[in-house]
């Protein structure tokens, strides 16, 4: 996702997972200076902010995802022990200091472990 100010790359736009897995929502970005990174979650039930931070500083994690998410300075986040309700769309926005922004999306499908799958 090229831009004059910010570039954003999402290596895997769709992720399939099973419940209780830890999932990495992986991205790479480049820009001038230190950007602000924001992840939001969107589903049929609405949209909510997950986390916002500037790499190198403390992340502001929403109450709904406290102790369930971990941030990385490359913009990626990890979701711990996902459930079916974590299925949905994850939108990352990278905004550089001068205001130039880029966004990208990742689709997460989380399914139950079926008994037949274990045999």
């Amino acid at each position: 996702l090229q831009s004059q100010g910010v570039s954003l790359y999402i290596p895997q736009a769709t992720i399939n997972a099973t419940v209780k897995e830890d999932i990495l929502l992986s991205v790479e970005y480049s820009c001038h200076g230190v950007p602000t990174i924001e992840w939001t979650y969107s589903s049929n039930w609405g949209t909510q902010k997950i986390v916002e931070w500037k790499p190198g500083t403390q992340a502001n994690i929403s109450q709904s995802h406290k102790d369930r998410v971990c941030t990385f300075d490359n913009g990626s986040i990890q979701l711990f022990s996902v459930g079916v309700r974590d299925s949905g769309y994850y939108v990352i926005t990278v905004t550089e200091r001068l205001g130039s922004s880029q966004f990208g999306t990742i689709v997460l499908h989380v399914s139950e472990i079926l008994y037949e799958d274990l045999h």
Partner: antibody, heavy 121, light 108 residues
């Protein structure tokens, strides 16, 4: 009834500036992202810029970045596009459109009738 | 950026016939994030389909959208006289937002 009315278009010389406005009514303006999309004569649609409902997040097409600025005044229910360093290739009908929500997803369910910008000497 | 390629450029059909319009994305990741618009001469675009296959408010059920991988399809099952227009696809999976070049559906 949702209504979007663009104004401010006209003839401008290359290198000149222009400010487009889009007056909105019939919905809670601050709750929706807004966009500008342009269409050169006889051509297809080209996205220009989008702004979130609160105005805090903006995105631009590379072709206008650094020259155009999108903004909004939620107290006046009005969207703006400040255009500078205009070029002949900016000649188009400029549409404003309402987003589905305050931010992503960025698709657009209501459109104005457009205002024509002509850049020529 | 994601490039959307629409085909054919022009579709010549008669009222009552079925129209199949294609929109191909240059990369995966568009998945469910595609909209279709209709535009008639001298008018603004009108949203038909969002999220690949959901009809917008007031859109008749002869319009439907589907996808397979990076290929997206708008189908009009029985063309009505008012359906002859230009159709554009648009992706909102990533910035910059992009539109396809359009398909003109004209009367044969």
């Amino acid at each position: 009834e949702v209504q979007l009315v663009e104004s401010g278009g006209g003839l401008v010389q290359p290198g000149g500036s222009l400010r487009l406005s889009c007056a909105a009514s019939g919905f809670t303006f601050s709750s929706y992202a807004m966009t500008w999309v342009r269409q050169a004569p006889g051509k297809g649609l080209e996205w220009v810029s989008v702004i979130s409902g609160g105005g805090g997040t903006t995105y631009y097409a590379d072709s206008v970045k650094g020259r155009f600025t999108i903004s909004r005044d939620n107290s006046k229910n009005t969207l703006y596009l400040q255009m500078s360093s205009l070029r002949a290739e900016d000649t188009a009908v400029y549409y404003c459109a309402k987003g589905y929500s305050s931010g992503w997803p960025y698709y657009f369910d209501y459109w104005g009738q457009g205002t024509l910008v002509t850049v020529s000497s | 950026e994601i490039v959307l390629t629409q085909s054919p450029g022009t579709l010549s059909l008669s009222p009552g016939e079925r129209a199949t319009l294609s929109c191909r994305a240059s990369q995966s990741g568009v998945t469910n994030f595609l909209a279709w618009y209709q535009q008639k001469p001298g008018q603004a675009p009108r949203l038909l389909i969002y999220a690949t296959s959901s009809r917008a408010t007031g859109i008749p059920d002869r319009f439907s959208g589907s996808a397979s991988g990076t290929d997206f399809t708008l189908t009009i099952t029985r063309l009505e006289p008012e359906d002859f227009a230009v159709y554009f696809c648009q992706q909102y999976a990533s910035s910059p937002l992009t539109f396809g070049g359009g398909t003109k559906v004209e009367i044969k």
